[in-house]
C-alpha cells in the first residue's frame, strides 16, 4: 500500500479582479474563394478541389451553377496555356478568405476593434485568424467583468457567394457553411479541425466561458509530462503542440513534405502530394493510428469551459435595415451574417488540482 502513490483531486473557485481573455481562432469552412482561383491555380489544384478530372477537364456535372460553370469553363481552357510555378502555401494565403472582407463589426469590452487585431494563422482549414494571440509584441487583453458587454462581439459575413462549388468529396471542400471557432490559451497553438466548434450563419451565438486551471501530478502520483517541449517548433509543451509536432513528423516520414499549416522546413506538399499522400495519411493518423502520436498531459494547463446558446439573426424586423446598412439583399443577410459573442460568465476561475494523498 505504501508504494501506491495515491492522489486526491482538489476543486476550488478563485475570485479574480481581472482575467486574461483567451485567444479566439476562427476559420471560414470554405478554404478558397472562388473569385481568387486563377487559371494557374485551377491547372495545378483543380483535381485536388474536384473541379477538374485527371485530364484537366471540367467533369460532366449537372450540379453546377450556370454562372460559376461559365467562369470555370473559361479558366479551364488550357489551350496554349503555359503553367507557371505554383505553391500551396501561397495559394492558401492569397485565395483564403480575408478577415478585412469578412469582419463587419468588432467590439472588445465595448471598444471598437478591427481586422488589424486578428493575426493570420494557418490550420488544416487553410487561412484562419486569431484574435488576442498575444504575439508580435501585443499584450494579452484582460477583462474586468463577466457578461456579454465585457468580452468579444464580432459580426461576420461568411461570403457564401465565394464558396467553391462541390462536385466531389475531398478534404479541401466543405459541405457546410459557416465558421469554426476555437477558444484556447495563448500558450498553445490552435488545433481547430479537431477541437473547434461550429458557428452557423443566420444566428447570433453566445459563448459563456469559464477559465479552468488544471494542475496534474507527475509520475508516480499521476501521468503528466513535467519536461519542457522537446521541439524545434513550439516554446511550451501542450497536447496540441505535441500533436501538431507529431503529425508533421508523420507526414514528412510518409510523404516527404508538410501541409501548409505545419511548422518546419520540409517542402510544402504539392497538390498531387496532398491528394495522393498527405490528406489520406493525416486522415489515417487522426482516425486509425492509436499509437504514433501519444501525447502526455502537461502538468499545468488552462482550458475554457463553454456554454453555447443561439438566437436568430436577422429578425423579420431588422432584415431590411441590415440589408440596407450592408448594401446586400435580405436573402444574402440571412445566408451569410453571423454574430459571435464570447465572454466570461463570472470573473473567477476554477482550479482542479491533483495533490499527493500523503507525503
Amino acid at each position: 500500500y505504501y508504494f501506491c502513490y495515491h492522489h486526491v483531486t482538489k476543486l476550488d473557485e478563485v475570485a479574480a479582479s481581472q482575467l486574461t481573455f483567451p485567444a479566439v481562432t476562427l476559420c471560414n469552412l470554405n478554404e478558397f474563394r472562388f473569385s481568387q482561383v486563377s487559371k494557374n491555380d485551377l491547372y495545378h489544384a483543380g483535381e485536388l478541389l474536384a473541379l477538374l478530372n485527371n485530364r484537366y477537364e471540367i467533369p460532366d456535372t449537372q450540379m453546377a451553377d450556370e454562372k460559376q460553370l461559365e467562369i470555370l469553363q473559361d479558366k479551364a481552357n488550357f489551350r496554349s496555356f503555359k503553367p507557371k510555378p505554383f505553391n500551396m502555401r501561397e495559394f492558401y494565403d492569397r485565395a483564403g478568405h480575408d478577415i478585412r472582407d469578412m469582419l463587419l463589426s468588432c467590439h472588445f469590452r465595448g471598444e471598437a476593434c478591427s481586422a488589424e487585431d486578428f493575426k493570420v494563422v494557418f490550420t488544416r482549414y487553410g487561412k484562419c485568424y486569431t484574435f488576442n494571440s498575444g504575439q508580435d509584441g501585443r499584450p494579452r487583453l484582460k477583462t474586468m467583468k463577466g457578461g456579454t458587454g465585457n468580452g468579444l462581439e464580432i459580426m461576420l459575413d461568411i461570403q457564401q457567394d465565394e464558396y467553391l462549388p462541390v462536385w466531389g468529396e475531398t478534404d479541401e471542400t466543405s459541405f457546410e457553411a459557416g465558421i469554426k471557432v476555437q477558444i484556447h490559451s495563448q500558450d498553445e497553438p490552435p488545433f481547430i479541425d479537431q477541437l473547434g466548434f461550429g458557428v452557423a450563419p443566420g444566428f447570433q451565438t453566445f459563448v459563456s466561458c469559464q477559465e479552468q486551471r488544471l494542475i496534474y501530478l507527475p509520475s508516480p502520483w499521476g501521468t503528466c509530462n513535467a519536461v519542457t517541449m522537446d521541439s524545434d517548433f513550439f516554446d511550451s509543451y501542450s497536447i496540441t503542440a505535441c500533436r501538431i509536432d507529431c503529425e508533421t513528423r508523420y507526414l514528412v516520414e510518409n510523404c516527404n513534405c508538410r501541409m501548409v499549416h505545419m511548422p518546419g522546413d520540409a517542402p510544402y506538399c504539392t497538390p498531387e502530394q496532398y491528394k495522393e499522400c498527405a490528406d489520406p495519411a493525416l486522415d489515417f493518423l487522426v482516425e486509425k493510428d492509436q499509437e504514433y502520436c501519444v501525447c502526455e498531459m502537461p502538468c499545468n494547463l488552462t482550458r475554457y469551459g463553454k456554454e453555447l446558446s443561439m438566437v436568430k439573426i436577422p429578425s423579420k424586423a431588422s432584415a431590411k435595415y441590415l440589408a440596407k446598412k450592408f448594401n446586400k439583399s435580405e436573402q444574402y443577410i440571412g445566408e451569410n451574417i453571423l454574430v459571435l459573442d464570447i465572454f466570461f460568465e463570472v470573473l473567477n476561475y476554477e482550479t482542479i488540482e491533483q495533490k499527493k494523498a500523503y507525503e
Epitope: E253, P280, A281, D283, F284, E287, K288, Q290, E291, Y292
Partner: antibody
Framework: EVQLLASGGGLVQTGGSLRLSCAAS????????MSWVRQAPGKGLEWVSG????????YYADSVKGRFTISRDNSKNTLYLQMNSLRAEDTAAYYC?????????WGQGIRVTVSS | DIQMTQSPSTLSASVGDRVTITCRAS??????LAWYQQKPGKAPNLLIY???NLESGVPSRFSGSGSGTEFTLTISSLQPDDFATYYC?????????FGQGTKLEIK
C-alpha cells in the same frame, strides 16, 4: 526504397511449428503497425494477424487465435510470426505488409506447406 | 468481424469494355477500402487506396468510388493486361478482411 523481405517458410508436419520473419528497410519500422496476410492455393486473401508499432497490441484472425503469435524486434527492424500446432489448412503463401493509409509494400510471399 | 462481399465472383468481358466490380461491407468502414489486382503466382498489387486514391503507376482507367458500406472499382476501358483477379480489403478495423475475389476473364 521501402522494402519487406520474408523468410522462414518450408515444409512442416501437421502439429509442427515454424517461425516466419519479415525484414524491413527504408522506413522507420517502429512507427508503423504491421500485418501478416496469407493465401491458400487457389483461394482468396486472408488477413492473419497484426501488431502495433511498439508491439504492445496484437490482433489475430479467429482461425489462428491461440496457435499463432505475432511479434516484432524494432531494434532489428524485423517482424515475426510464430506458428504452432500447424494444420493442413494453414498451407498457404504468407505475406507481410506495412499498415498505413495504404498497405504498401507487401513482402514477396513465403510458402508454408503443412503435410500429414 | 466485418464481412466483405464482392460481386460478381466471375466476370467475362472483352477488351475495350467498361467493367464495374462491387464490394459491400457488413457495416460502415468509412472510406478505408483498398482494391488489389493479383495475377497467378504473384503478390497482390495495390490499385486503389482509401476508396478512390489511385496508387502511383496505376493506369488512370482504374477508378474507385463509394463510402460507408458500398464501394465500386471501375475499369473504364479493359486492356489485355487487366485480366486478373481483383480483391477489395477493408482496413477500418481489426480483423481486417478481404472480399472473396472477382476473377475477370476474357469473353
Amino acid at each position: 526504397e521501402v522494402q519487406l523481405l520474408a523468410s522462414g517458410g518450408g515444409l512442416v508436419q501437421t502439429g509442427g511449428s515454424l517461425r516466419l520473419s519479415c525484414a524491413a528497410s527504408g522506413f522507420t519500422f517502429s512507427s508503423f503497425a504491421m500485418s501478416w496476410v496469407r493465401q491458400a492455393p487457389g483461394k482468396g486473401l486472408e488477413w492473419v494477424s497484426g501488431i502495433s508499432g511498439s508491439g504492445g497490441s496484437t490482433y489475430y484472425a479467429d482461425s489462428v487465435k491461440g496457435r499463432f503469435t505475432i511479434s516484432r524486434d524494432n531494434s532489428k527492424n524485423t517482424l515475426y510470426l510464430q506458428m504452432n500446432s500447424l494444420r493442413a489448412e494453414d498451407t498457404a503463401a504468407y505475406y507481410c505488409a506495412k499498415e498505413a493509409y495504404k498497405w504498401q509494400p507487401w513482402g514477396q510471399g513465403i510458402r508454408v506447406t503443412v503435410s500429414s | 468481424d466485418i464481412q466483405m462481399t464482392q460481386s460478381p465472383s466471375t466476370l467475362s468481358a472483352s477488351v475495350g469494355d467498361r467493367v464495374t466490380i462491387t464490394c459491400r461491407a457488413s457495416q460502415s468502414i468509412s472510406s478505408w477500402l483498398a482494391w488489389y489486382q493479383q495475377k497467378p503466382g504473384k503478390a497482390p498489387n495495390l490499385l486503389i487506396y482509401k476508396t478512390s486514391n489511385l496508387e502511383s503507376g496505376v493506369p488512370s482507367r482504374f477508378s474507385g468510388s463509394g463510402s460507408g458500406t458500398e464501394f465500386t472499382l471501375t475499369i473504364s476501358s479493359l486492356q489485355p493486361d487487366d485480366f486478373a483477379t481483383y480483391y477489395c480489403q477493408q482496413y477500418n478495423s481489426y480483423s481486417y478482411t478481404f472480399g472473396q475475389g472477382t476473377k475477370l476473364e476474357i469473353k
